[in-house]
């Protein structure tokens, strides 16, 4: 697309050639400026600087209308105009480019006076030589090591040129490096050659762990050099612990086998396990900035001495690509049981799942299934739903992986396929499931408990019925009651106990005569069609000493219920003080009909009764 | 501080009488039900009787061994539990406690203990 | 009435170790059963109610379990301050009675 021309305005001191003001507003890129509104609105454009010597100045244009300006537009500006756009552009935090960066670095060509006012990141591309005097670099490197100095790659003559003037200017003779040295050099420390580390071990070492990019050859073989002599600060390997490990993760990769043979095997399990586990623990995959084009192309050939020949923890410091390219999908299928061991990121997890799905498009095999681990944490129910699993093992060792969590939709999606592939809710199935789920059995429909046959009642714990409603006690009850008919009274009332939600009120009349004391807990979750018809006299022996909690659950269905289907009376025979039981002189008249609609029985006051009372009454003297 | 104090211990002669005195502090006295509980020399803890709570009209629970004999009350405007013995034996000598007897989630038991006091009988 | 027996009046052990007290119910009690802890000069604690449930605060190396007649308290990886008189209570039919206690005591 071709720059806008614009005539020279008097007092320019651009050039016509230089383009519009609209042109730097509204271009959104370096490639591809967008229209500019001189274009839709016919006017011709003013140049740039011409603009900026009159209002509206830079300092009133907004971060969006800043952000995308070309080269092109600076490069005709005065050096006072220029200084003003990257005050503008820090007072408005505009994110800039490499590009602009140096575009406007170059432009200002004598040293700023006023550091503080310009864009952090631009520092970087200004020249430190001319900030030579003690006060002047000073003040220069102490703005730089708050910017972002992996904007520069390794290479970049700008990056290469800071770290010599840096040390310089804090006065650092040889390799030997104090803490405020280390602090005072920010980003720059990364770049500081393997002889610092070397004899800087104990305060270079902990800043190096948070470096983004990888370390040089250089620095890797000091680095790893000084961690095996195992000085200060982390000790000799042999005595690390999981939060020396944890201290240690950007230097990991660095780690050669002898070391990771000295650490203690109790200390590397742990730290894996602890890695593996917790998402918290897993470190977001650092990755190098490089262009796409070239990303493309490195995916596809693996480097050299990098294929790998087993899964192993040498893994873990591979890039995705390098996991891509390097890993056999059919050695991955063979090795499974090795994955859970080794602490991979979940982006690592990702490409690992990505070379089984190539493998295997129709399903996973079972003998992969049953070793994914926690790369089972990354499948979808899509991917499930194309398993076949048979084996209660397979079963049990991927609810293991979500073992404390929640059942997530890919764990009822396993369940459900393992369950249908069956026929049904076997004992052992059910065993399995209630003790990595509690809840599961209430968590399927009356229909779906309908095919539990009564043998796998044996394996249901009082814990897996806590969250079970009344429809579902109903089809469970009459399962319990046959699978524990044969056992006697006192046994038959421990087993069922948690079953009786579902009992009918025949089945409580007859608990009340054995004794049973049943605690509240139980009563109260009792249906309560079923608790209304028992007299005062059952439900004190069906309750025993729990009796004394009635008072305090009388506001609480059943027993608000029940009592107000019992003569007051009775009730004041339990000596608990409950109230609102039928008053002496009243008449229940049980009108079920009525007693559907209002859920209360009909009582009939003495006004309107006392006919019926006077005709009771006679006939009872005659 | 929850705490149970009893008082009123001693030395009395088969069939004499003897009343002992719970001084409760630190709860709201009426809401529960206060219970009594001895312990024989060598011998295990024996439950006597409760008195429910305000809410359930100051109602009584006694043990078939000391029903007849023994009587709880309380006073509540002094936050006082009492049980008074009656036509005392030798096989009521124990170390008498009072206990709050407790009901949380559907669930019964004894959260609050005195250190007791010690009734001899003997001629 | 109910008995609760207690069997062992004493029983040692050594910090680190898994002891079971036992108590047996003289007939059928469900699993209406309580465990208490008393320290010497303390008042009794509830540690387990309905046999098998944990009362908050409780650690849970103790664990109870039984039902019907025969009842224990477990109490793994045995500290210091467990040292105490444990006994157990049925509240399963008036009067309330309970065991005669089971001192644990160290070796």
């Known amino acids: 697309m071709a720059l806008p021309t614009a005539r020279p305005l008097l007092g320019s001191c651009g050039t016509p050639a230089l383009g519009s003001l609209l042109f730097l507003l509204f271009s959104l890129g370096w490639v591809q400026p967008s229209r500019t509104l001189a274009g839709e609105t016919g006017q011709e454009a003013a140049p740039l600087d011409g603009v900026l010597a009159n209002p509206p100045n830079i300092s009133s244009l907004s971060p969006r209308q800043l952000l995308g300006f070309p080269c092109a537009e600076v490069s005709g500006l005065s050096t006072e105009r220029v200084r003003e756009l990257a005050v503008a552009l820090a007072q408005k935090n505009v994110k800039l480019s490499t590009e602009q960066l140096r575009c406007l670095a170059h432009r200002l060509s004598e040293p700023p006076e006023d550091l503080d006012a310009l864009p952090l990141d631009l520092l970087l591309f200004l020249n430190p030589d001319a900030f030579s005097g003690p006060q002047a670099c000073t003040r220069f490197f102490s703005r730089i090591t708050k910017a972002n100095v992996d904007l520069l790659p390794r290479g970049a003559p700008e990056r290469q040129r800071l770290l010599p003037a840096a040390l310089a200017c804090w006065g650092v003779r040889g390799s030997l490096l104090s803490e405020a040295d280390v602090r005072a050099l920010g980003g720059l420390a990364c770049d500081l050659p393997g002889r610092f580390v070397a004899e800087s071990a104990e305060v270079l070492l902990p800043r190096l762990v948070s470096c983004p990019g990888p370390l040089d050859q250089d620095q890797q073989e000091a680095a790893r050099a000084a961690l095996q002599g195992g000085g200060p600060p982390y000790g000799p390997p042999s005595t690390w612990s999981v939060s020396t490990m944890d201290a240690l993760r950007g230097l990991l990769p660095v780690l050669g086998q002898p070391i990771i043979r000295s650490i203690p095997q109790g200390i590397v399990a742990a730290w894996r396990q602890r890695s593996s586990r917790d998402p918290s623990w897993r470190q977001p995959e650092r990755t190098i900035l490089r262009p796409r084009f070239r990303r493309e192309v490195e995916k596809t050939a693996c480097p050299s001495g990098k294929k790998a020949r087993e899964i192993d923890e040498s893994l873990i410091f591979y890039k995705k690509w390098e996991l891509e390219a390097c890993v056999d999908a059919a050695l991955l299928a063979t090795q499974m049981d090795r994955v859970n061991a080794i602490p991979f990121t979940y982006e690592q997890l990702d490409v690992l799942k990505h070379k089984l799905d190539e493998l295997y498009p129709q399903g996973y095999p079972e003998s992969v299934i049953q070793h994914l681990g926690y790369l089972f944490l990354k499948m979808s129910p899509e991917d499930i739903r194309k398993w076949n699993v048979t084996s209660l093992e397979t079963l049990k060792a991927l609810l293991e992986v979500n073992k404390g969590h929640e059942m997530s939709p890919q764990v009822a999606t396993l369940i459900d396929r393992f369950v249908k592939g069956r026929g049904q809710l076997d004992k052992d199935t059910l065993d399995t499931l209630t003790a990595f789920y509690p809840g599961y059995l209430c968590s399927l429909s009356p229909e779906e408990l309908s095919s539990v046959p009564p043998s796998s009642i044996w394996a249901v714990r009082p814990q897996d019925l806590d969250t079970c409603d009344p429809r579902q006690l109903d089809v469970l009850y009459p399962k319990a009651r046959l699978a524990f008919q044969n056992m006697n009274g006192s046994e038959y009332f421990v087993k069922i106990q948690s079953f009786l939600g579902g009992a009918p009120t025949e089945d409580l009349k007859a608990l009340s005569q054995q004794n049973v004391s049943m605690d509240l807990a139980t009563f109260m979750k009792l249906r309560t069609d079923a608790v209304l018809p028992l007299t005062v006299a059952e439900v004190q022996k069906l309750l025993g000493p729990h009796v004394e909690g009635l008072k305090a659950e009388e506001r609480h269905r059943p027993v608000r219920d029940w009592i107000l289907r019992q003569r007051q009376d009775d009730l004041d025979t339990l000596g608990l003080g409950l109230q609102g039981g039928i008053p002496n002189g009243y008449l229940v008249l049980d009108l079920s009909m009525q007693e559907a609609l209002s859920g209360t029985p009909c009582l009939l006051g003495p006004g309107p009764v006392l006919t019926v009372l006077a005709l009771l009454l006679a006939s009872t003297l005659a | 501080e929850v705490k149970l104090v009893e008082s009123g211990g001693g030395l009395v002669q088969p069939g004499g009488s003897l009343s002992l005195s719970c001084a409760a502090s630190?709860?709201?006295?009426?809401?529960?039900?206060m219970s009594w509980v001895r312990q024989p020399p060598g011998r295990a803890l024996e439950w006597l009787g409760f008195?429910?709570?305000?809410?359930?009209?100051?109602?009584?629970e006694y043990s078939a061994s000391v029903k007849g004999r023994f009587t709880i009350s309380r006073d509540y405007s002094q936050s006082i539990l009492y049980l008074h013995m009656n036509a005392l034996r030798a096989e009521d000598s124990a170390t008498y406690s009072c206990?709050?007897?407790?009901?949380?989630?559907?669930?019964?038991?004894?959260?609050?203990w005195g250190t007791g006091t010690t009734v001899t009988v003997s001629s | 009435d109910i008995v609760m027996t207690q069997s062992q009046k004493f029983m040692s052990t050594s910090v680190g170790d898994r002891v079971s007290v036992t108590c047996k119910a003289s007939?059928?009690?469900?699993?209406?059963v309580a465990w208490y802890q008393q320290k010497p000069g303390l008042s009794p604690k509830v540690l387990i109610h309905?046999?098998?449930y944990r009362f908050s605060g409780v650690p849970d190396r103790f664990t109870g379990s039984g039902s019907g007649t025969d009842f224990t308290l477990s109490i793994s990886n045995v500290q210091s301050e467990d040292l105490a008189k444990y006994f157990c209570?049925?509240?399963?039919?008036?009067?309330?009675?309970f065991g005669a206690g089971t001192k644990l005591e160290l070796k």
């Open positions: 007939q059928n009690v469900g699993t209406n």
């Open positions: 630190g709860f709201t006295f009426t809401d529960y039900y």
């Open positions: 008195i429910r709570g305000k809410a359930n009209g100051y109602t009584t």
């Open positions: 206990a709050r007897y407790y009901y949380s989630n559907y669930v019964w038991y004894f959260d609050v």
């Open positions: 309905s046999a098998s």
């Open positions: 209570q049925q509240y399963n039919s008036y009067p309330l009675t």
